[in-house]
């Protein structure tokens, strides 16, 4: 005859307030005849948690059907967990006896402790934008978790980052803890569409980590490159000059044309296009009237991007006498 063993596989069970806790207990033998009861604590003052046969235990249900003939699973579920439920739970086998049943064997116990889930991580980027090749800092914060052990990882576009510092507070015992981590990220010119992710893993999350994200588009400024060109074709008395502003971010941009130092107020045609990497291109066309009196026209395209100092490009217009006379199309 096999000796009865009471198996409680979990030494520690972490549960969150309001949830249901499952306490496992299996037996290795049906003998001796008698009930299995659940208690919290030990000694004469121990608290009866569940007795299948009598008593009132509205928060407790059994995992399997205890009335099945050869049932060996005496696991229970306790609903609506509160802080008052913490403690060590024992499943205890009794042998039928007279006048009282006699305690025969106890399981090793499962300690139920309160776990609290971390809050959703909040990721904050720098207050001001920075240009590529520079380093920016992102912070990630999550609060209210217990126990203290927690894992935090940083990713940029799915690639794990290594340059970060993490602190968990407080250092001593507490009912709940907070984590704060700062990651240093080197910006690349193509980072407009990039994301940084802060990932928090905790025992209460059951393998499903929480993530907070920040878009690098909020942190990066890609300054434009300028090119001013004169179109080879001429329409009547007018020459078309193009200012191409390439690869900038964010979209905020002011463009002004100057003729020989004088700012031109007249309307100009322009188009804005978005590149695959999230940066923008802006093309502005400026029509210059050509007359005999205008031999030396210097055009300036000035761009003020995202509140930064203006940058400009100049073009000395090339108009040949032949072009003036013939009104024919010309290549400068």
């Amino acid at each position: 005859e096999e000796e009865l063993q009471m198996i409680q596989p979990e030494k520690l069970l972490l549960v969150t307030v309001g949830k249901t806790a499952t306490l496992h207990c299996t037996v290795t033998s049906l003998l001796p005849v008698g009930p299995v009861l659940w208690f919290r604590g030990v000694g004469p003052g121990r608290e009866l948690i569940y007795n299948q046969k009598e008593g009132h235990f509205p928060r407790v249900t059994t995992v399997s059907d205890l009335t099945k003939r050869n049932n060996m699973d005496f696991s229970i579920r306790i609903s609506s967990i509160t802080p008052a439920d913490v403690g060590t739970y024992y499943c205890v086998k009794f042998r039928k006896g007279s006048p009282e049943n006699v305690e025969f064997k106890s399981g090793p116990g499962t300690e139920m402790a309160l776990g609290a889930k971390p809050s959703a991580p909040v990721v904050l980027g720098p207050a001001a934008r920075t240009t590529p090749e520079h380093t920016v800092s992102f912070t990630c914060e999550s609060h209210g978790f217990s126990p203290r052990d927690i894992t935090l990882k940083w990713f940029k576009n799915g690639n794990e980052l290594s340059d970060f510092q993490t602190n968990v507070d407080p250092t001593g015992q507490s009912v709940a803890y907070s984590i704060r981590s700062t990651a240093r990220v080197v910006l690349d010119p193509w980072d407009v569409r990039s994301q940084v992710i802060c990932e928090v893993a905790h025992v209460t999350l059951q393998g499903d980590p929480l993530r907070g994200t920040a878009n690098l588009s909020e942190a990066i400024r890609v300054p434009p490159t300028l090119e001013v060109t004169q179109q080879p074709m001429r329409v009547g008395n007018q020459v078309n000059v193009t200012c191409q502003v390439r690869k900038f971010y964010p979209q905020s941009l002011q463009l002004t044309w100057s003729e020989n130092g004088n700012v031109c107020q007249r309307e100009t045609a322009s188009t804005l296009t978005e590149n695959k990497d999230g940066t923008y291109n802006w093309t502005s066309w400026f029509l210059v009237n050509i007359s005999d009196q205008r031999d030396d026209v210097v055009l300036t395209c000035q761009v003020k991007h995202d509140g930064q100092l203006a940058v400009s490009k100049r073009l000395a217009l090339e108009v040949t006498v032949h072009q003036k006379d013939q009104s024919s199309d010309a290549t400068p």
Epitope: K53, G55, E100
Partner: antibody
Amino acid sequence: EVQLVQSGAEVKKPGATVKISCKVSGFNIKDYYMHWVQQAPGKGLEWIGRIDPEDAETKYAPKFQGRVTITADTSTNTAYMELSSLRSEDTAVYYCDRGLAYWGQGTLVTVSS
Amino acid sequence: EIVLTQSPATLSLSPGERATLSCSASSSVSSSYLYWYQQKPGQAPKLWIYSTSNLASGIPARFSGSGSGTDFTLTISSLEPEDFAVYYCHQWSSYPYTFGQGTKLEIK
């Protein structure tokens, strides 16, 4: 829904035997202890005993030991309480209850010559 | 056998007043095994408080239970007319199970 329905009132002569039934529904009688409690007119509650219908194991209060027999029929989901050698002081309402939580409506037994 | 002694036998109070019912055990009773029942005339007892301090389903929050060892208490913070009844404490810590003799809560 858990229900415990007891048999009707009984009038018995001293020395006779009474057998009260308690038919349950909403649960399997084998799963719980079935208790019996006495309440004499104007008096308090007194525990008589209980049965584990799964294996017919019984426990009785010393006061009733020898005169009371509690049985259960698992096929009909019914518990029984039989009290013999009735005397006038056995005049009372008898309750069955399931595991101390749910009670039957009571059965009045009057012992009178 | 564990003898349960309830006091007072009768408690006369008015609605709105606070009621304190005591139950004293002749030997120690684990709090898990101390129940209270309410009974009204012509009705079966109803489970009112289980495991010393837990209110059975549907029992108003003005009721509370406390105690340990040999001394247990049922308290009603502010009496309502429907609270007037007989209350019994009950132990099922050891055989034979026993009840207190009851406290009758009556309207003053």
